[in-house]
Amino acid sequence: FERTRSLQDPCSNCPAGTFCDNNRNQICSPCPPNSFSSAGGQRTCDICRQCKGVFRTRKECSSTSNAECDCTPGFHCLGAGCSMCEQDCKQGQELTKKGCKDCCFGTFNDQKRGICRPWTNCSLDGKSVLVNGTKERDVVCGPSPADLSPGASSVTPPAPAREPGHSPQ
């Protein structure tokens, strides 16, 4: 079949990095600058991806493979093949359309990306709060109050006076 195909279609002999040039009697011509063909038998070369602005070049384009981008520091990749770059925030914040905003009281984010998540509710597991939560860290649950030896007490969280926070968008 391959032999038959190559007799019928001279383009099938054109390797990756070239294209079958109809303007030149179907001769295999090298891909022009800033273009590539990753498979043989192509009738055109694809334009190389340009990594600029929020994107930076991770791998240069070659005649046989597309460029690969990642994000300029301060941003991180989203999507297949880093199709988008999204702003980093500080720990204790989440990204909204208004930019980076502090986590609301009772929520935390220990990463530079993602949303603020509620502190663990220790009492749901019958445990007590050993270490209070912050904007950047979840609470640490300790043994259940019944497990504590007489005289010992768990760390109780402060009265829930709301600190200036930000509702997730």
Epitope: L78, C85, E86, Q169
Partner: nanobody
């Protein structure tokens, strides 16, 4: 081909003003949130401002609030950044960038940006 081209940068004295422009080709600007981001010398990229499709929502990083104004002219497929009361710390390369499909709903990713225009604030 989808493209963004910034212009309007230059050298300006502290307290001065500049207006940056961004021309969009290959797509319809009115379908997208648009953003300005900047990169100061030796620093990471910083988000500056964004504007929704019809211009009714505009948001700014704290450091430029009251000094910068983002606007758009969808009929001209153009985005703008009016910068006033400029400070030395505003010195940077400014990029316009398109919010990707679904921006503001489940992500804040930018999928297209230009080559940038340089703003230098110095006496």
């Amino acid at each position: 081909q989808v493209q963004l081209v910034e212009s309007g940068g230059g050298l300006v004295q502290p307290g001065g003003s500049l207006r940056l422009s961004c021309a969009a080709t290959g797509f319809t600007l009115s379908n997208y949130w648009m953003n300005w981001v900047r990169q100061a010398p030796g620093k990471g990229l910083e988000w500056v401002a964004n504007i929704n499709q019809d211009g009714s929502e505009r948001y700014y990083v704290d450091s430029v609030k009251g000094r910068f104004t983002i606007s758009r002219d969808n009929a001209k497929n153009s985005l703008y950044l009016q910068m006033s009361s400029l400070r030395a710390e505003d010195t940077a390369v400014y990029f316009c960038a398109r919010g990707g499909e679904g921006y503001g709903v489940n992500h804040y990713g930018l999928d297209v940006s230009g080559q940038g225009t340089t703003v230098t604030v110095s006496s």
